[in-house]
């Protein structure tokens, strides 16, 4: 895990401010308004029956 | 480091009550998605209950098997995870087992707590 | 409910030795981008441990002969060349939609 600043996080995740390190963009789909989101590429919102079965 | 430690378990009558305890650390609890699972002695693994966050209003998701029998509850002020089992079966006698995520992949694991149902 | 089909539920192998366990899903738990299964560990009396999230991201401090892949319904994990302290219980696991299902394990043991 990279610290801002030094080397972009690997491919297919993101930086959080939030919990200082990378986060995987895959859990977006998930969890949409965390913060690393904005810099995946494509997060799609999670579906309806997801959040809440 | 993360630890996750469970206690709480313990020898139950069929029918009775027991109340399961998670002390977590070394991560942002408050952050985080948790649930219990359990291992039946000799089996595989089962989903048992989850609990979101704050933001999620304390969003709660239970498997059928213990739905209206089973309650997951948390306080973030005290990093501790909740399982309030009623109704016990000789079926839920299992290791219980404390997980932490922040979505989908269980990162986190306590070590267990046996529950054992019977009379 | 998604059911998760593990195969094979045990094997005997040697050190050394390629190992590919099978899990297939009873639906897609996969998007266009990422797909929604993951792998732990086990050893006998101790917790599961994460190995692999999103089908083939390999979690911090996993050894890299540990290997994942598949995407739709079916996936598969693999220890290129197994060691004694691969000698364990391995479990597949979907996040697609509540309720969260397993696989029902596939034991390693030493042949």
């Known amino acids: 895990e990279q610290a801002p600043g030094t080397a972009p996080c690997s491919r297919g995740s993101s930086w959080s401010a939030d919990l200082d390190k990378c986060m995987d963009c895959a859990s977006c789909r998930a969890r949409p308004h965390s913060d690393f989101c904005q810099g995946c590429a494509a997060a799609p919102p999670a579906p309806f029956r997801l959040l809440w079965p | 480091q993360v630890e996750l430690v469970e206690s709480g378990g313990g020898l139950v009558q069929p029918g009775g009550s027991l109340r399961l305890s998670c002390a977590a650390s070394g991560f942002t609890f408050s952050s985080y998605w948790m649930s219990w699972v359990r291992q039946a002695p000799g089996k595989g693994l089962e989903w048992v209950a989850e609990?979101?966050?704050?933001?999620?209003?304390?969003?709660?998701h239970y498997a059928e098997s213990v739905k209206g029998r089973f309650t997951i509850s948390r306080d973030d002020s005290k990093n501790s995870l909740y399982l309030q089992m009623n109704s016990l079966r000789a079926e839920d006698t299992a290791v219980y087992y404390c997980t932490g995520y922040y979505a989908d992949a269980m990162d986190y694991w306590g070590q267990g707590t046996l529950v054992t149902v019977s009379s | 409910d998604i059911q998760m089909t593990q195969s094979p539920s045990s094997l005997s192998a040697s050190v050394g030795d390629r190992v590919t366990i099978t899990c297939r899903a009873s639906q897609s738990v996969s998007t266009s981008s990422y797909s929604y299964m993951h792998w732990y560990q086990q050893k006998p009396g101790k917790a599961p441990k994460l190995l692999i999230k999103y089908a083939s991201n390999l979690e911090s401090g996993v050894p890299s002969r540990f290997s994942g892949s598949g995407s739709g319904t079916d996936f598969t994990l693999t220890i290129s060349s197994l060691q004694p302290e691969d000698f364990a219980t391995y479990y597949c696991q979907h996040s697609w939609e509540i309720p969260y299902t397993f696989g029902g394990g596939t034991k390693v043991e030493i042949k």
């Open positions: 609990i979101r966050l704050k933001s999620d209003n304390y969003a709660t």
